[in-house]
């Protein structure tokens, strides 16, 4: 479905994205509702995800997400994280929306979701150094798995943006 076709009754809604990919939701009332993600974004549960192929600093990555009315990925469940991992390339690292601005090992998510130590996915021996204040998802061969790693925030990496699905 073209975005323009879906906006017949939503003329006041302004979005950055010119093309949406939508799924019809069965509603109890007669009017049709659509659940949409921007074209080339991945859809999972109630969110849309954009996996960048360009590298940038953590701050620039967050700005790039914001320009698309999104934010760097906030991981809420194991299922969400596993879905993301399936769509990443093993040789790259991807910034997420978790950082430690003061270097005090006080981690915070960009959307203010509380950081829960008991549901984290750090690689063994991570986080490694308070000078590394931003988090990437990366793959390790021993043991073979994806996980979290603290890195220099200025070092350019790929990133994952997240936004809520658009409902029309």
């Amino acid at each position: 479905q073209k975005y323009s076709q879906l906006l017949e009754k939503k003329t006041t809604k302004e979005l950055v994205h010119t093309t949406l990919e939508c799924v019809k939701k069965n509603m109890p009332v007669e009017e049709t509702a659509w659940s949409c993600c921007p074209k080339n974004w991945k859809s999972f549960s109630s969110n849309c995800y954009f996996i960048s192929t360009e590298s940038a600093s953590w701050q620039d990555s967050e700005k790039d997400c914001a320009r698309m009315e999104a934010h760097l990925l906030v991981i809420n469940t194991q299922e969400e994280q596993d879905f993301i991992f399936q769509n990443l390339q093993e040789e790259s690292a991807y910034f997420v929306g978790l950082s430690d601005p003061e270097g005090q090992r006080h981690w915070q998510w960009v959307d203010q979701t509380p950081y829960n130590e008991s549901s984290t996915f750090w690689h063994p021996r991570e986080p490694s150094d308070p000078n590394e204040r931003c988090v990437v998802l990366n793959f390790r061969k021993s043991p073979k798995r994806w996980g979290w790693n603290d890195v220099n925030c200025l070092g350019p990496q790929r990133s994952v943006c997240e936004m809520m699905k658009i409902h029309l």
């Epitope: 270097g103 070092g155 990496q157």
Partner: antibody, heavy 117, light 111 residues
Framework: EVQLQQSGTVLARPGASVNMSCKAA????????VYWVKQRPGQGLEWIGA????????SYNQKFQDKATLTAVTSASTAYMELSSLTNEDSAVYYC??????????WGQGTLVTVSA | DIVLTQSPASLAVSLGQRATISCRAS??????????MHWYQQKPGQPPKLLIY???NQESGIPARFSGSGSRTDFTLTINPVEADDVATYYC?????????FGAGTKLEIK
Amino acid sequence: EVQLQQSGTVLARPGASVNMSCKAAGYSFTSYWVYWVKQRPGQGLEWIGAIYPKNSRTSYNQKFQDKATLTAVTSASTAYMELSSLTNEDSAVYYCTRPHYDSFGYWGQGTLVTVSA
Amino acid sequence: DIVLTQSPASLAVSLGQRATISCRASESVDSYGISFMHWYQQKPGQPPKLLIYRASNQESGIPARFSGSGSRTDFTLTINPVEADDVATYYCQQSNEDPLTFGAGTKLEIK
């Protein structure tokens, strides 16, 4: 200045257990992992494992999984390593270290363990 | 496990000359653009001392005579010019994969 002060020389019998300590000073103890490294006389270096004092997470070299137990007491800024079921192969100098990025940036002076009947 | 092979096992260099020590890894120690290879110096009766971290970064307080280079599987520690105080054993170490591993060491002597 970062300092790691290790406990003194230990003489132990085969089959016994020993405990050694590593007292940290000059940095935030809970912000860094503490690593342990083994060096047998005249030989190379082996990584044993590491502990993150903030939440007591550990990471072991599988080779030492059943040999070493790592703990930490944050109130005393001290990390501990217990070695069990000692044999002659465990006679070595054991170092605690604090990472600099992912390298071993700061080292204790070492604890010599001698296993002898 | 990643095996680190150092060469030579020992070398003798004249004062003021260049010493070059090689460390070859059995597989790449690079991840997301960083080489997780480090170099240490150890003198008898002392703990090792960090010289170079992440392949080419000089630890603070280490003389500029010590430099590191390389990526993926091949790394080099260079001491130029060699001084009498450099007599020691030098180790490479990787931190890209568990378990962390060390090379067997290279003993540097003065000719």
